[in-house]
C-alpha cells in the first residue's frame, strides 16, 4: 500500500544556475493523496529559514505530482542563496531539502559560465 504521507521531492544538494534580470520559476514538487497541503517557501539565513511573505507563488498540476512554484520576476542579485519548501500536513511540518540558486550578474560576466563552473567558482556568485 502506497504511503499517503506528504512528500516534497526537491533533490538533495540540487542547484540552479540563473542570471540576474531573467525570469525564473523555482518548483517544489509535492506528492499528496487527498487534500493538498499548505506549502510555503523560505530562504536560508545561516541555520534559520526565513519565510518568504508576499511573493508571487502558484500551483501547477501534473499527472502524479503537484508543483508549488516560487516566481522570480525578474531574478535579482539578492536572490542568490538556498531555499526550502515546507508543507503543513496534519499539524506536522514536512521540510524539503534545500536547493541553491547561484545568481550571476550578466553585467559582471563577459560570457555566461557553464553550469558546472557556476557551482565550482564561488567568486562569480553573490553571497
Amino acid at each position: 500500500k502506497e504511503s499517503c504521507d506528504v512528500q516534497l521531492y526537491i533533490k538533495r544538494q540540487s542547484y540552479h544556475s540563473i542570471f540576474a534580470g531573467d525570469p525564473f520559476k523555482l518548483e517544489c514538487p509535492v506528492k499528496y493523496c487527498a487534500h493538498r497541503p499548505q506549502v510555503t517557501w523560505c530562504k536560508l539565513n545561516g541555520t534559520t529559514c526565513v519565510k518568504l511573505e508576499g511573493r508571487h507563488t502558484s500551483w501547477k498540476q501534473e499527472k502524479n505530482l503537484s508543483f508549488f512554484i516560487l516566481h522570480f520576476e525578474p531574478v535579482l542579485p539578492s536572490d542568490n542563496g538556498s531555499y526550502r519548501c515546507s508543507a503543513n500536513f496534519l499539524s506536522a511540518i514536512i521540510e524539503s531539502h534545500s536547493t541553491t540558486l547561484y545568481v550571476t550578474d550578466v553585467k559582471s560576466a563577459s560570457e555566461r559560465p557553464s553550469k558546472d563552473e557556476m557551482a565550482s567558482r564561488p567568486w562569480l556568485l553573490y553571497s
Partner: antibody, heavy 120, light 112 residues
Framework: QVQLQESGPGLVKPSGTLSLTCADS????????IHWVRQPPGKGLEWIGR????????RYNPSLKSRVTISSDKSKNQASLKLSSVTAADTAVYYC?????????????WGQGTTVTVSS | DIVMTQSPDSLALSLGERATINCKSS???????????LNWFQQKPGQPPKRLIY???KLDSGVPDRFSGSGSGTDFTLTISSVQAEDVAVYYC?????????FGQGTKLEIK
C-alpha cells in the same frame, strides 16, 4: 526494476576521446542523479562525476574536471560520459550508477560496467 | 577532497569469525541536514559494487543481518558477525556528504 547499461568503444587511442553511454530502463532519469564511477584494473573505485538530468547540471571530480563532460538526453532516457586526452592511466571499467532518493541518497543501482582500454 | 582511509587493506578469516573493517574520513561526514551519508559497498570479482549499508548503520533490503555498520563524525566500522564463504569480496566505504564524492581504497576479505 532499475536497469542500467553502459555502452561504447572498448578501445580508445591515446590522446583520443572516450565516449560512453548509459541507457536507463525502469525509471525516468530526470527523477534522480546519474553518476559515473571508474575502476582501473586491480584497483579501487574512483568517482568521476554526476549529472542532474532534470536540468543538465553537473558536478565533477576536480582531478578529472578539465577533461570530463557528462551530459544527458531526457528524450532517450540516457546519460553520456566523454573523457578527452586519454592516456593508458584511463584504462578502466567504467560504471554508471543511479542515486536513489529519500532516505538513501547513495548509489543503489549500477550498470554491469564496460571495459575501456587506452592503447594504440 | 575528503580522504577515506580504510583499514586493514586485507583480512583473512576462518568461517564463523568476526570481521571488522574501519573507515576514517579526513573531515566530518555529518551533513547540514543532520544526517551522515556514509555508505558501505560490497564488490565481488567481475561484478559491480552492491550497496550494503546506508546512513552509517541502515541495512539495505536483502542484506543478511550478520552485516552491521556503526560510527559517527569521522570514524566508521563495518562488522560481519560471522563470516560466510559468500562474503569473500572487496568492501568499500563511500561518502555522499561532500563533493567530490570519494571511496575508501577497499578492504579485501578472504577465507583462510
Amino acid at each position: 526494476q532499475v536497469q542500467l547499461q553502459e555502452s561504447g568503444p572498448g578501445l580508445v587511442k591515446p590522446s583520443g576521446t572516450l565516449s560512453l553511454t548509459c541507457a536507463d530502463s525502469g525509471f525516468s532519469i530526470s527523477d534522480t542523479y546519474i553518476h559515473w564511477v571508474r575502476q582501473p584494473p586491480g584497483k579501487g573505485l574512483e568517482w568521476i562525476g554526476r549529472i542532474d538530468p532534470a536540468n543538465g547540471f553537473t558536478r565533477y571530480n576536480p582531478s578529472l574536471k578539465s577533461r570530463v563532460t557528462i551530459s544527458s538526453d531526457k528524450s532517450k532516457n540516457q546519460a553520456s560520459l566523454k573523457l578527452s586526452s586519454v592516456t593508458a592511466a584511463d584504462t578502466a571499467v567504467y560504471y554508471c550508477a543511479r542515486e536513489d532518493g529519500y532516505p538513501y541518497y547513495t548509489l543503489d543501482s549500477w550498470g554491469q560496467g564496460t571495459t575501456v582500454t587506452v592503447s594504440s | 577532497d575528503i580522504v577515506m582511509t580504510q583499514s586493514p587493506d586485507s583480512l583473512a578469516l576462518s568461517l564463523g569469525e568476526r570481521a571488522t573493517i574501519n573507515c576514517k574520513s579526513s573531515q566530518s561526514l555529518l551533513d547540514v541536514d543532520g544526517k551522515t551519508y556514509l555508505n558501505w559497498f560490497q564488490q565481488k570479482p567481475g561484478q559491480p559494487p552492491k550497496r550494503l549499508i546506508y546512513l552509517v548503520s541502515k541495512l539495505d533490503s536483502g542484506v543478511p543481518d550478520r552485516f552491521s555498520g556503526s560510527g559517527s563524525g569521522t570514524d566508521f566500522t563495518l562488522t560481519i558477525s560471522s563470516v560466510q564463504a559468500e562474503d569473500v569480496a572487496v568492501y568499500y566505504c563511500w561518502q555522499g556528504t561532500h563533493f567530490p564524492r570519494t571511496f575508501g581504497q577497499g578492504t579485501k576479505l578472504e577465507i583462510k
